[in-house]
């Protein structure tokens, strides 16, 4: 019988008392065979973390800094439930650490050396740990003691709680460095006042500070935020211009066997019965015998952290970088103006082989990192384990939602200035066998479908988006009798037609033979009624152009396109018979890597791009025998995006809206995780 007890860790006598009351009150609001509470008392949060890791307790609520400690080996804990603040309609689970400056001051993030700084307090998250952690490698050596390095970096500071005797420069702007509100420049409002009064040039606070201190928009307009990419933005654009996004207060549990479903069931039922304004007898978010016992008194409720989210993703790349810099104190040897090798993310075995060949030929400019699915690759780019990959538009959308940016676009048409002219896109089409003459766009119900993969543009987002508008529900597996849509749930009818063996069946990578454009077309040839692919797929795999046994005798004339008006047309008439225009595949990366990825890829395509005439004896970046490994095989070049440098601008309003509509049908655990961080 699974143990349905959640052992809550308390760190004081008062917390233990509240925990016992929590335990007793939960008994009547949960079924007798449901989760129950037990209380475990420890001396500190770090002891609680160790106890959970050792399976002596199951859950505790932590601030962001401790979530980082809990995640580190050997603890390996993960966030499972987040407290939220504000309203249920607009729940806030994160705050943003920002650098505020006066509008006319004219310097950027990389020009802070020699400026005067205002901090909320020494060792505090938004006011010290995050900004100093991110600036760590710019601090003058020796970087220990840290206070001395910071004092030598800025020309003067107010860092309340610092030792004014040992580090007088840190108290230059607020004599004495008092560690309470008696110091007018202490805390969030104090640090902002330090900037406002003209004592400092920059204040490190949280995003809400400026709104709490300046009710008038005209006053707020006198200030700006410094962004990590060395630009500035208005103060209300903090979601796109911050130093880090920080979770407020989070319940953690073991990564393996952590009872997260049980913890959620318990806390969700608890907030239902004992949350804000629910009950007089016991209140979850109230601490009569102290402050913030078990949970923050200011919390309004709980949200389940998506299961795909580990601590690194939850805390975010910037926060983890800042805290790791402070804790580990290591900085790269290389001068910062030189690009490090780009770590390319390769999907499964076939892509890894090609990537390794690229790496050798690039003489150290490219390194390879492997993952089993596109989403795993995106996650690795997010957390810094990888740097870049080329993605179908559907995944550019997910990557964009996860904070990545497009940097170059694949171009498929030969032109004189290929690299300077990103194309409008390719066509998403529905292909059928000519012999199935009664089949039209209007009678696909009950037919067998072939898709490149779930979440991809031509194979899924466009056709299923159109279908959703028609049927108004997400049960596509009931609409088609069976199909192959790699990435579907294994027991779904949309995995039934797939050909992968064992664990590879229906996997969204090349181990599944019906994956991708060529795979979906092969599925049509061998088993299906309709394939959703790009307009070039049929010509690329017929007339002897694909030498594989299944394709070598195929004839383009044996296939037709389904038009949205219910008619059919020959394959070459795709311009007048398609489902929609699809954005070209694009290379994505993190914002901090954008310039280097751009620079190195442009060098690489000049060496190994379409200008290489003999691919039998030389490495060709855009060739892989119709398998579309790393890049589409019909790529002519990688083109500059000019001003289309965000996922929304790159994909276009229409496509973003179409994918947004399909979101309610999404099975993407990564998209769910990323929209949790940024709804």
């Amino acid at each position: 019988v699974p143990d349905k007890t959640v052992r809550w860790c308390a760190v004081s006598e008062h917390e233990a008392t509240k925990c016992q009351s929590f335990r007793d009150h939960m008994k009547s609001v949960i079924p007798s065979d449901g989760p129950s509470v037990a209380c475990v008392k420890k001396a500190s949060y770090l002891d609680c973390i160790r106890a959970i890791a050792a399976n002596e307790a199951d859950a505790v609520t932590l601030d962001a800094g401790l979530v980082y400690d809990a995640y580190l080996a050997p603890n390996n804990l993960k966030p499972v439930v987040a407290e939220f603040y504000g309203s249920k309609e607009d729940p806030q689970t994160f705050y943003y650490a920002v650098a505020v400056v006066k509008k006319d001051s004219g310097f950027q993030m990389n020009q802070l050396r020699g400026k005067k700084s205002c901090h909320t307090g020494l060792g505090r998250s938004a006011g010290w740990n995050i900004p100093i952690g991110l600036l760590y490698c710019d601090l003058p050596e020796p970087r220990k003691p840290l206070e001395k390095a910071v004092a030598n970096f800025f020309s003067g500071s107010c860092a309340p709680c610092a030792d004014g005797t040992d580090f007088p420069q840190l108290c230059q702007l607020c004599p004495g460095c008092g560690c309470s509100t008696l110091n007018q420049y202490f805390g969030y409002s104090g640090a902002f006042k330090c900037l406002k009064d003209g004592a400092g040039d920059v204040a490190f606070v949280k995003h809400s500070t400026i709104f709490e201190n300046l009710a008038n928009k005209a006053d707020r307009d006198q200030y700006e935020l410094l962004c990590l990419d060395n630009t500035r933005k208005p103060v209300d654009e903090y979601k796109d211009c911050h130093l880090a996004q920080v979770p407020s207060h989070t319940v953690v549990a073991r990564s393996m066997g952590g009872k997260e479903d049980l913890i959620w069931e318990l806390l969700n039922q608890a907030q239902e019965h004992f949350g804000k304004d629910k009950s007089k007898e016991f209140q979850l978010f109230s601490s009569p015998h102290g402050k913030d016992l078990l949970f923050k008194d200011s919390a309004h409720g709980f949200l389940k952290v998506p299961p795909r989210m580990d601590a690194k993703m939850y805390l975010g790349y910037e926060y983890v970088t800042a805290i790791r810099n402070l804790r580990e104190g290591t900085c790269p040897e290389a001068p910062t103006d030189e690009c490090k090798p780009v770590k390319w993310c390769a999907l499964s075995h076939h892509e890894r082989l090609k990537c390794d060949e690229w790496s050798v030929n690039s003489v150290g400019k490219i390194e390879c990192v492997s993952a089993e699915t596109t989403e795993d690759c995106i996650a690795k780019i997010m957390n810094g384990e990888a740097d870049a990959m080329s993605l179908d538009g559907g995944f550019v959308y997910i990557a964009g939602k996860c904070g990545l940016v497009p940097v170059l676009a694949e171009n498929y048409n030969k032109s004189d200035n290929c690299e300077d002219t990103p194309e409008a896109g390719y066509f998403a089409i529905a292909v059928v066998k000519k012999s199935a003459s009664d089949l039209t766009w209007d009678n696909l119900k009950g037919k067998k479908s072939c898709h490149t993969a779930v979440g991809r543009t031509a194979g899924w987002n466009i056709p299923m988006g159109l279908l959703y508008n028609k049927i108004n529900h997400c049960r596509f597996d009931e609409f088609f009798s069976e199909g192959c849509a790699p990435g579907s749930k294994k027991d779904s009818s949309l995995c039934k037609l797939c050909m992968g063996s064992g664990l590879n069946l229906c996997e969204p990578n090349n181990k599944e033979g019906y994956y991708g454009y060529t795979g979906a077309f092969r599925c049509l040839v061998e088993k299906g009624d309709v394939a959703f692919v790009k307009h070039q797929t049929v010509p690329q795999n017929t007339g002897g152009k694909n030498p594989d046994p299944w394709a070598k005798n195929l004839n383009e004339k044996d296939y037709e396109l389904l038009c949205l008006d219910g008619t059919r047309k020959p394959v070459e008439e795709y311009a007048n018979c398609h489902l929609a225009r699809a954005p070209n595949h694009a290379v994505v990366t993190r914002k901090d890597k954008e310039a280097c990825v751009h620079k190195i890829l442009r060098q690489q395509q000049h060496l190994f791009g379409s200008n290489v005439t003999d691919c039998s004896g030389n490495f060709c970046l855009f060739r892989s025998e119709t398998k579309d490994l790393l890049f589409r095989d019909d790529t002519v070049c990688l083109a500059k995006l000019h001003d289309r440098n965000t996922y929304e601008k790159y994909l276009g309003e229409e496509y973003v809206k179409a994918v947004g509509n399909l979101r309610k049908c999404s099975t993407s655990s990564l998209l769910e995780a990323c929209t949790f961080r940024r709804p």
Epitope: K4, S28, P31, S32, D33, G34, D261, E265, E272
Partner: nanobody, 128 residues
Framework: DVQLVESGGGSVQAGGSLRLSCRAS????????MGWFRQAPGKEREGVAV????????YYADSVKGRFTISEDNAKNTVYLQMDSLKLEDTAMYYC?????????????????????WGQGTQVTVSS
């Protein structure tokens, strides 16, 4: 108005399998106890399998443990009951039910009295 729509019932040989579906419409799906109950002719309604929607625990009657699996699809607001190794005694009308609002529990998750929203039912017949 909350509605539960069941489907997937039918006749099957002993040892065979069936998959029942129950779709909830008209309410916030996550964070409720929802599951399957059955009633054979002349017998009381009994709990079969329940889950806490939106990623919570699962609960099974002893008589079906290891043979039946309850699961959910959040995107479709749907709960499934996969019934394998069916026996003659599994023959019954199967009902989907949901706890909406804050119920008070004095007994187990499989106690039908706590559930306030019910579907019309779907017949499952197992023959030898």
């Amino acid at each position: 108005d909350v509605q539960l729509v069941e489907s997937g019932g039918g006749s099957v040989q002993a040892g065979g399998s069936l998959r029942l579906s129950c779709r909830a419409s008209g309410h916030a799906y996550s964070g409720n106890y929802m599951g399957w109950f059955r009633q054979a002719p002349g017998k009381e309604r009994e709990g079969v399998a329940v889950l806490y929607t939106g990623g919570g625990s699962t609960y099974y009657a002893d008589s079906v443990k290891g043979r039946f699996t309850i699961s959910e699809d959040n995107a479709k607001n749907t709960v499934y009951l996969q019934m394998d190794s069916l026996k003659l005694e599994d023959t019954a009308m199967y009902y989907c039910a949901l706890v909406l609002g804050s119920a008070r529990w004095y007994t187990s998750s499989l106690d039908a009295r706590a559930y306030n929203i019910w579907g019309q039912g779907t017949q499952v017949t197992v023959s030898s």
